[in-house]
């Protein structure tokens, strides 16, 4: 049993059909020893009498918050959650596995450029009486800080009979130094409670390898006389860390017809500006990345080429 | 919503059988901890046994460990509530109820419940 914050506690519980549970012992927080009772959640079935309270945990309905009184008066309470973990893995029921990039992937992190900030989210299918509390640091043994702030709803959506909800969150790097190689990485821990239920997500990085640019920003095109070309230019977006010298973007050019099917005219480059054909009814979507780091590509950034 | 529907109750003697089945509509059925609940008259509900979600896993009241078994088919919505050797103290309206805490006895982890099917055994 450890202790998640004031007054809220978690125990450990490896369940199994007639595990054992966890012996529990429950303290008052008062000066009083004589005359006091022990309840649980809205009961009033008087559950023992003392100032110390032991309890064998053995499922969610031993959780709950268990509450010390004396004369009709409320001494003190105790919330205990579980955290339970089943043939050796602890539950993961809160959180969807987004399964990208991989299996077991319960938060995802991005970063639009090297200042040290990024931003995690998640989702679940629950609705009500759920809180997240996230916590981050560069590396583990001797911690250097991050600041992240509330965790919030930031989307909903229906998946067939079933509504999504995505959580996020924003971290900054206390003393980042966006040009520096960085050795440690990032640590994330979400904190998720559902009623009784804890469980606790972590996810490891380098801001490196979740570096994903803003598209680019004022796409124009230009036609060039007497030609079926078009000079297509871009800007570096604003969101990307300066100097552009030193981090620098590539950028891929497409051409596409206004049937998916039809084949794409793609054109890599390190310039701001390129020279395409542009097709009737066809767009010009233009998207970046780091030049130097094969992190991920932006979204594209399009123009019709009419 | 989720809304939960009982049938198979009816009268059988001691030492039989009897098959309860629960069907559930509404949100992905999936996603709850199926439960099982009775209740005889002038007594509190009881805890029978609860199935996961995936169900992988069940958990009974010592009262029918052994003679009772929960299952469930997540491609049909329902869950089922086998029981075998049945005494007469296992009269009583039976409950199904659908929550997101695994394992749990108390009624209070349940957030949706059914209307409850009656089953009587006579000796």
């Known amino acids: 049993i450890w202790e998640l914050k004031k007054d809220v506690y978690v125990v450990e519980l490896d369940w199994y059909p007639d595990a054992p549970g966890e012996m529990v012992v429950l303290t008052c927080d008062t000066p009083e020893e004589d005359g006091i009772t022990w309840t649980l959640d809205q009961s009033s079935e008087v559950l023992g009498s003392g100032k110390t309270l032991t309890i064998q945990v053995k499922e969610f309905g031993d959780a709950g918050q268990y509450t010390c009184h004396k004369g009709g008066e409320v001494l003190s309470h105790s919330l205990l959650l579980l955290h339970k973990k089943e043939d050796g893995i602890w539950s993961t029921d809160i959180l969807k596995d987004q399964k990208e990039p991989k299996n077991k992937t319960f938060l995802r992190c991005e970063a639009k450029n090297y200042s040290g900030r990024f931003t995690c989210w998640w989702l679940t299918t629950i609705s009500t009486d759920l809180t997240f509390s996230v916590k981050s640091s560069r590396g583990s043994s001797d911690p250097q800080g991050v600041t992240c702030g509330a965790a919030t709803l930031s989307a909903e959506r229906v998946r067939g009979d079933n509504k999504e909800y995505e959580y996020s969150v924003e971290c900054q790097e206390d003393s980042a130094c966006p040009a520096a190689e960085e050795s440690l990485p990032i640590e994330v821990m979400v904190d998720a409670v559902h009623k009784l239920k804890y469980e606790n997500y972590t996810s490891s990085f380098f801001i490196r390898d979740i570096i994903k640019p803003d598209p680019p920003k004022n796409l124009q095109l230009k036609p060039l006389k007497n030609s079926r070309q078009v000079e297509v230019s871009w800007e570096y977006p604003d969101t990307w860390s300066t100097p552009h010298s030193y981090f620098s973007l590539t950028f891929c050019v497409q051409v596409q017809g206004k049937s998916k099917r039809e084949k794409k005219d793609r054109v890599f480059t390190d310039k701001t500006s390129a020279t395409v054909i542009c097709r009737k009814n066809a767009s010009i979507s233009v998207r970046a990345q780091d030049r130097y780091y094969s992190s991920s590509w932006s979204e594209w950034a399009s123009v019709p080429c009419s | 919503e989720v809304q939960l529907v009982e049938s198979g109750g009816g009268v059988v003697q001691a030492g039989e059988s009897l098959r309860l089945s629960c069907a559930a509509s509404g949100r992905s059925f999936s996603n709850y901890e199926m439960g099982w609940f009775r209740q005889a008259p002038g007594t509190e509900r009881e805890f029978v046994g609860t199935i996961s979600r995936r169900g992988s896993s069940t958990y009974y009241a010592d009262s029918v460990k052994g003679r009772f078994t929960i299952s469930r088919d997540n491609a049909k919505n329902t869950v089922y509530l086998q029981m075998s050797s049945l005494k007469p103290e296992d009269t009583a309206v039976y409950y199904c109820?659908?929550?997101?805490?695994?394992?749990?006895?108390?009624?209070?982890?349940?957030?949706?419940w059914g209307q409850g099917t009656q089953v009587t055994v006579s000796s």
């Open positions: 109820a659908a929550g997101q805490l695994f394992p749990s006895s108390h009624s209070r982890d349940y957030d949706y």
